[in-house]
């Protein structure tokens, strides 16, 4: 057949769906690869064709749209499963073509099993809530388009294995779950189960997300340099190892990039000739505040190195700070036999 623009296997869109639940999967061509939508393509006489490759097989085969109760169907640019089965797992391809044009993309679909507490290999989206910040809500995700607005589904919310009822600060409100005041104890996995009727059958949609309670913007401060500080003097003799830790606390800030760096005499360590190594470690608090430690190390320090200016810098979306380390050369202790004896007039 004629050449087809093949976008390959789009592994960025690893689609996971639960077994025995409806799934609607849009052809990724129109969302991520082509500059026109399905309606335009259809009006121009292009046809959307679906086929698939079963798990652990190489053979591409057409999708069977003649299954009982239309278990698999296509509607515009959407492939429907009502419901999925475990052996629907595989790579699916949607191809848009006419006699002169062809474009296709494949994507993996994984049908996963869940247990009675909604545990599964499903990758969960994370929703961050600010601690002690007033009312915040999460919404049951990815349920649009499954039923018309005239259908009123029932929605049940769970935290872990427990149905949410009479929780002191968490209130189910239909598709939304409201947190009156988010606390660390609200961390966990939340599941909404949406039940709706369709053509005399009842379907369930299960959606789980992870709630992570993070530091509030009310508590956010510019970076705080705990070390170096004015209380510690790094006093060394030439030839000794110089180790200076720079320890910086960063408040959690959504989408902030936290940076720590050293300068030596105003230059980045990479831009100077002395043999400096810098090791970084990072720890996170329960609310995702961050402590970064960068240890500046000079294995064998020279008297010249001990005269340099060592400054630790830190930057976040809240501001930039810097602190110089107090470095000095240790005055050698007097050698009694020579220096003190000389003081007594001995030669």
């Amino acid at each position: 057949s004629e050449r087809c623009d093949d976008w390959g296997l789009d592994t960025m869109r690893q689609i996971q769906v639960f077994e025995d639940e409806p799934a609607r999967i849009k052809c990724p061509l129109f969302e991520h690869f082509l500059k026109f939508n399905y309606s335009t393509a259809h009006s121009a006489g292009l046809t959307l064709i679906w086929y698939w490759t079963r798990q652990d097989r190489d053979l591409e085969e057409p999708i069977n749209f003649r299954l009982p109760e239309n278990r698999i169907s296509k509607e515009k640019d959407v492939l429907w499963f009502r419901p999925t089965l475990l052996n629907d797992t595989g790579n699916y391809t949607c191809m848009l073509r006419n006699t002169t044009y062809c474009s296709k993309v494949a994507f993996p679909l994984e049908v996963v099993q869940k247990d009675s507490c909604f545990n599964s290999p499903m990758k969960l989206p994370v929703h961050k809530l600010y601690i002690e910040y007033g009312i915040q809500r999460i919404t049951c995700p990815n349920v649009d388009g499954y039923f018309p607005s005239s259908v009123k589904p029932t929605i049940t919310w769970y935290m872990g294995c427990y149905k949410i009822q009479n929780f002191n600060n968490v209130i189910p409100e239909g598709m939304n779950l409201s947190f009156l005041i988010a606390l660390i104890s609200n961390n966990g996995n939340y599941t909404c189960v949406v039940t709706y009727p369709e053509n005399g059958r009842t379907f369930h949609l299960t959606r789980t997300l992870t709630v992570k309670v993070v530091g509030s913007p009310k508590n956010a401060v510019p970076p705080v340099i705990h070390s170096p500080n004015d209380h510690v003097v790094y006093e060394k003799e030439p030839g000794e190892e110089l180790l200076i830790p720079c320890t910086v606390y960063f408040s959690f800030l959504m989408d902030s990039r936290n940076e720590v760096w050293w300068t030596i005499d105003g230059k980045k360590p990479d831009d100077i000739t002395i043999d400096v190594t810098i090791n970084e470690s990072i720890s996170h608090s329960r609310t995702e505040d961050e402590t970064r430690t960068q240890i500046l190390s000079i294995k064998k320090v020279t008297s010249e190195d001990l005269k340099r200016s060592y400054v630790c810098h830190a930057r976040s979306a809240k501001g930039e700070v810097a602190k110089a380390a107090k470095v000095k050369q240790k005055v050698p202790a007097p050698r009694y036999t020579v220096e003190l004896a000389c003081g007594f007039g001995a030669t």
Partner: antibody
Framework: QVQLVESGGGLVQPGGSLRLSCAAS?????????MCWVRQAPGKGLELVAC???????TWSASWAKGRFTISKTNSTTLYLQMNSLRAEDTAVYFC????????????WGQGTLVTVSS | DIQMTQSPSSLSASVGDRVTITCQAS??????LAWYQQKPGQAPKLLIY???TLASGVPSRFSGSGSGTDFTLTISSLQPEDFATYYC??????????FGQGTKVVIK
């Protein structure tokens, strides 16, 4: 009324076992509380023993407690500490406490139960 | 493991005195420090969390300050009911959950 009540303490011989209980009232474990056992030897300070998230069941134990002390919970409102191979130095008041992972308005302690390990 | 070092281990003071207790962490814990008061035969009572936030019902003569590794609990004017043992607690993350060894405040 929101409270914690410990029980199960008493006299036990070295090498023996004991199971402490902590009954929660006024709340249940369906919310993800961080429930801990903290001990205090006579005339000494507070020492964290083990903790559990009540919803997920994830646990944490002090390094010295691993292998001898096990924290667990029932589905609803009871926390346990199973203590095996007890030693004289385990003699202490054992407190049950809530939300030590972010002590704030929800922080709560029981009155404690005394465990004496002696022959 | 983190070490929390309180000083002094005990202090004697009179009613009306200003009292300061310090707590030093062996590694940076940001603002994640709580202070508790414990009286003989009783459970600890939360006084301050997040280094400086007063727990509900705690008198304003208690205050906390500090961040990183160095923290202070101050009682601005000691009252008869304040004679007790005070503990600091780190809760930055599960690797840093620990109590200080305590500071006993006794009547001079």
């Amino acid at each position: 009324q929101v409270q914690l009540v410990e029980s199960g303490g008493g006299l036990v011989q070295p090498g023996g076992s004991l199971r402490l209980s902590c009954a929660a009232s006024g709340f249940d474990f369906s919310s993800n509380y961080y429930m801990c056992w903290v001990r205090q030897a006579p005339g000494k300070g507070l020492e964290l023993v083990a903790c559990i998230y009540t919803n997920s069941g994830n646990t944490w134990s002090a390094s010295w407690a691993k292998g001898r002390f096990t924290i667990s919970k029932t589905n609803s409102t009871t926390l346990y500490l199973q203590m095996n191979s007890l030693r004289a130095e385990d003699t202490a008041v054992y407190f049950c406490a809530r939300d030590l992972n972010y002590p704030d308005t929800s922080n709560l302690w029981g009155q404690g139960t005394l465990v004496t390990v002696s022959s | 493991d983190i070490q929390m070092t309180q000083s002094p281990s005990s202090l004697s003071a009179s009613v009306g005195d200003r009292v300061t207790i310090t707590c030093q962490a062996s590694q940076s814990i940001g603002y994640y420090l709580a202070w508790y008061q414990q009286k003989p035969g009783q459970a600890p009572k939360l006084l301050i969390y997040r280094a400086s936030t007063l727990a509900s019902g705690v008198p304003s003569r208690f205050s906390g300050s500090g961040s990183g590794t160095d923290f202070t609990l101050t009682i601005s004017s000691l009252q008869p009911e304040d004679f007790a043992t005070y503990y600091c607690q780190s809760y930055y993350n599960s690797d840093s959950d620990a109590f200080g060894q305590g500071t006993k405040v006794v009547i001079k």
